[in-house]
């Protein structure tokens, strides 16, 4: 068998809402993956599990099942959405995200994704993780790759 390549492309959009009573931020983050099947037979993308971390705390998880079948030597782009909540001990972020003196409220999130593929009864898992900028102050649609946070050695806390 040849490889199945998974490439995390980046954040496609982030839609924000607030609960003023709870001082809580809700971010629906849609991410894009490219999955390439380098084999001469079809493979099934069985599931995608994703989680988002802010400051080493998991703020959102998602799982998609029975997603698609990728034909031989084919590539498919898959979008998946992770609902995230910044609350409780991180409610200090509500101050930052709702401060109107700032126009771009970028926070650094760690996106983790695991893709499970199957072919001929064999299962394979491929994982990726990437730091991304997301604006927690307004709804944003990104050009693919625009939200990448390059300084992975020093993520903002």
């Amino acid at each position: 068998p040849r490889s199945i390549d998974v490439k995390y492309i980046g954040v496609k959009s982030a839609y924000v809402s607030y609960d003023v009573q709870k001082r809580t931020i809700y971010l629906n983050i849609t991410n894009t993956l490219n999955i390439t099947n380098n084999n001469y037979y079809s493979v099934e993308v069985e599931n995608i599990t994703a989680q988002v971390q802010f400051s080493k705390t998991v703020i959102g998880k998602a799982r998609l099942n029975n997603i698609t079948i990728i034909g031989p030597l084919d590539m498919k782009q898959i979008d998946y959405t992770v609902p995230t909540v910044i609350a409780e001990e991180m409610s200090y972020m509500y101050d930052f995200c709702t401060l109107i003196s700032i126009k771009v409220h970028n926070i650094v999130l760690m996106m983790q994704v695991t893709v499970t593929t199957t072919y001929f009864g064999h299962s394979e898992q491929i994982s990726q993780e990437r730091y991304q900028y997301v604006d927690c102050g307004r709804n944003t649609t990104y050009q693919l790759g625009q939200s990448e946070y390059l300084n992975v050695l020093q993520p903002q806390q």
């Epitope: 009573q21 709702t98 401060l99 126009k103 307004r138």
Partner: antibody
Framework: EVQLVESGGDLVKPGGSLRLSCAAS????????MSWIRQTPDKRLEWVAT????????VYPDSVKGRFTMSRDNVKNTLYLQMSSLKSEDTALYYC????????????WGLGTSVTVSA | DIVMTQAAFSNPVTLGTSASISCRSS???????????LFWYLQKPGQSPQLLIY???NLASGVPDRFSSSGSGTDFTLRISRVEAEDVGVYYC????????FGGGTKLEIK
């Protein structure tokens, strides 16, 4: 109904101090940033200070930086503006206003409290 | 600081006709995020300022649709399609691209 009621305005001498208050009601005070704006005798509006919803961040223009301090008490639903080293040019009607994080505007204003700095 | 410039008085208008009020900023208020941080406030006699327009062209809650606003990055116009007696007051443009600054205000005059 959103209500903002300022108080504490007075006649003070140059170099003196004064603390203004703004009592908020009709909305979840702890969920919104707040601002102070003043209107000079010639009717010009000048932004004075902004504080974030939890009081973590404050922002001031150079004209009042180091002399004015904005704070808030989210239990009492009250906003404060501590003014010191007052000058004659600080004479104005002082308004408090709510910052709206969707419109990025100051969407509700109080009726104001008058501060006069004069010898 | 960004300077906002307005004429002190509008051209006198007749009730029921349209009025335009202009404002100019010393720097473009269009942010790279696509939002123009230009606002209009109306101060009626004896009252505090009230929000009319946010982000250049959006009508604030409760504001009649007789009001509209348009502009480029630096030149802006507030239009009132059918002026009513209750529209009398001073109209301020403001920006918060870089902290808040206000124009000097334009007094709407009725013939």
């Amino acid at each position: 109904e959103v209500q903002l009621v300022e108080s504490g305005g007075d006649l003070v001498k140059p170099g003196g101090s004064l603390r203004l208050s703004c009592a908020a009601s009709g909305f979840t005070f702890s969920g919104y940033g707040m601002s102070w704006i003043r209107q000079t005798p010639d009717k010009r509006l000048e932004w004075v200070a902004t504080i974030s919803s939890g009081g973590r961040y404050t922002v001031y223009p150079d004209s009042v930086k180091g002399r004015f301090t904005m704070s808030r008490d989210n239990v009492k639903n009250t906003l404060y503006l501590q003014m010191s080293s007052l000058k004659s040019e600080d004479t104005a009607l002082y308004y408090c206003a709510r910052d709206n994080f969707y419109s990025y505007a100051m969407d509700y204003w109080g009726l104001g409290t008058s501060v006069t700095v004069s010898a | 600081d960004i300077v906002m410039t307005q004429a002190a008085f509008s051209n006198p208008v007749t009730l029921g006709t349209s009025a335009s009020i202009s404002c100019r900023s010393s720097k473009s208020l269009l942010h790279s995020n696509g939002i123009t941080y230009l606002f209009w406030y109306l101060q009626k006699p004896g009252q505090s300022p009230q929000l009319l327009i946010y982000q250049m062209s959006n009508l604030a809650s409760g504001v009649p649709d007789r009001f509209s606003s348009s502009g480029s990055g630096t030149d802006f116009t507030l239009r009132i399609s059918r002026v009513e007696a209750e529209d009398v007051g001073v109209y301020y443009c403001a920006q918060n691209l870089e902290l808040w600054t206000f124009g000097g205000g334009t007094k709407l005059e009725i013939k």
